[in-house]
């Protein structure tokens, strides 16, 4: 895991990567497996009623550097982790919701493995 605000995304692979997908499966996925030229991710966020919702899937290479950066969004608790080291690596990602801080947010780190 890279911490301390580093902004390097995981290294993309020279071959297709298969990821588990849940609540975020594209049309071309089969048996809850998607494929990508980028990263696998798992994300946890609060829904409108304050309950934690876990989503996982594929992020395309384009723009995923930004998406894998756990940039805080005002009034929204969420955390994302990305990985590329093996197929379905996001099965082993377990991001946690950031603590409540008077609904105030500091710059968060990037999470990946």
């Amino acid at each position: 895991k890279k911490e301390d605000g580093e902004s390097t995304a995981p290294t993309p692979r020279p071959k297709v990567l298969r990821c588990k997908c849940h609540h975020h499966c594209p049309e071309d996925s089969v048996n809850n497996i998607c494929s990508t030229d980028g990263y696998c991710f798992t994300m946890i966020e609060e829904d409108d009623s304050g309950l934690p919702v876990v989503t996982s899937g594929c992020l395309g290479l384009e723009g995923s550097d930004f998406q894998c950066r756990d940039t805080p969004i005002p009034h929204q608790r969420r955390s994302i982790e990305c990985c590329t080291e093996r197929n379905e690596c996001n099965k082993d990602l377990h991001p946690t919701l950031p603590p409540l801080k008077n609904r105030d947010f500091v710059d968060g780190p990037i999470h990946h493995r």
């Epitope: 297709v16 298969r18 594209p26 089969v30 497996i33 395309g60 290479l61």
Partner: antibody, heavy 116, light 112 residues
Framework: QVQLLQPGAELVKPGSSVKVSCKAS????????MQWVKQRPGQGLEWIGE????????LYNQKFKGKATLTVDTSSSTAYMQLSSLTSEDSAVYYC?????????WGQGTTLTVSS | DVVMTQTPLSLPVSLGDQASISCRSS???????????FHWYLQKPGQSPELLIY???NRFSGVPDRFRGSGSGTDFTLKISRVEAEDLGVYFC?????????FGSGTKLEIK
């Protein structure tokens, strides 16, 4: 240069199993998937499945689940496909092929003949 | 499964002529990443297939520029501007967007 070396032919009896090999050279074996494709005489190409040698993760065509089993030996950069409970329908040419996002190199093919 | 329909099945040509092969898929081949994983292969008699064009229009290394791939979505075309003797064989289209990956039934390019 990239090479995928397969045995030219295998002759086996109905009901038996066979393990076809594919020895890769000229590239880093774990950097690409290995796919297997079936071609019956005068017919088209059928995708059997693929294996990622870096973590042995496999994906199969539903049609070949239970028929084909894909494995690798990274120490010798060799991929294997085992076919079980062979019948005359399994007589075909079987190709291994290197896959990143598309197949760019093919083996020369192994002609499998199932006959008593 | 995605069905790849190739036309024509047989294409008799004279050397030096232009040849055109079409391939239509039963569903869009645009992947969720935005890439279109559609490819063309040539299988010469007694040989294994060889890659000509990948991702719709990119010529593989060593492939002459008389080979041109085009198309999008579900409709794709391979054009050979001046057919040479070494171009004869069976052309297959293929998709690696959807699992299971599938191939067209082939177009046999032969001398008139």
């Amino acid at each position: 240069q990239v090479q995928l070396l397969q045995p030219g032919a295998e002759l086996v009896k109905p009901g038996s199993s066979v393990k076809v090999s594919c020895k890769a050279s000229g590239y880093t074996f774990t950097n690409y998937w290995m796919q297997w494709v079936k071609q019956r005489p005068g017919q088209g190409l059928e995708w059997i499945g693929e294996i990622d040698p870096s973590d042995t993760y496999t994906l199969y065509n539903q049609k070949f689940k239970g028929k084909a089993t894909l494995t690798v030996d990274t120490s010798s950069s060799t991929a294997y496909m085992q076919l079980s409970s062979l019948t005359s329908e399994d007589s075909a040419v079987y190709y291994c092929a290197r896959f990143g996002y598309y197949v760019d190199y093919w083996g020369q093919g192994t002609t499998l003949t199932v006959s008593s | 499964d995605v069905v790849m329909t190739q036309t024509p099945l047989s294409l008799p040509v004279s050397l030096g002529d232009q040849a055109s092969i079409s391939c239509r898929s039963s569903q869009s081949l645009v992947h969720s990443t935005g890439n279109t994983y559609f490819h063309w292969y040539l299988q010469k008699p007694g040989q294994s297939p060889e890659l000509l064009i990948y991702k719709v229009s990119n010529r593989f290394s060593g492939v002459p520029d008389r080979f041109r791939g085009s198309g999008s979505g579900t409709d794709f075309t391979l054009k050979i501007s001046r057919v040479e003797a070494e171009d004869l064989g069976v052309y297959f289209c293929s998709q690696s967007t959807h699992v299971p990956f599938t191939f067209g039934s082939g177009t046999k390019l032969e001398i008139k």
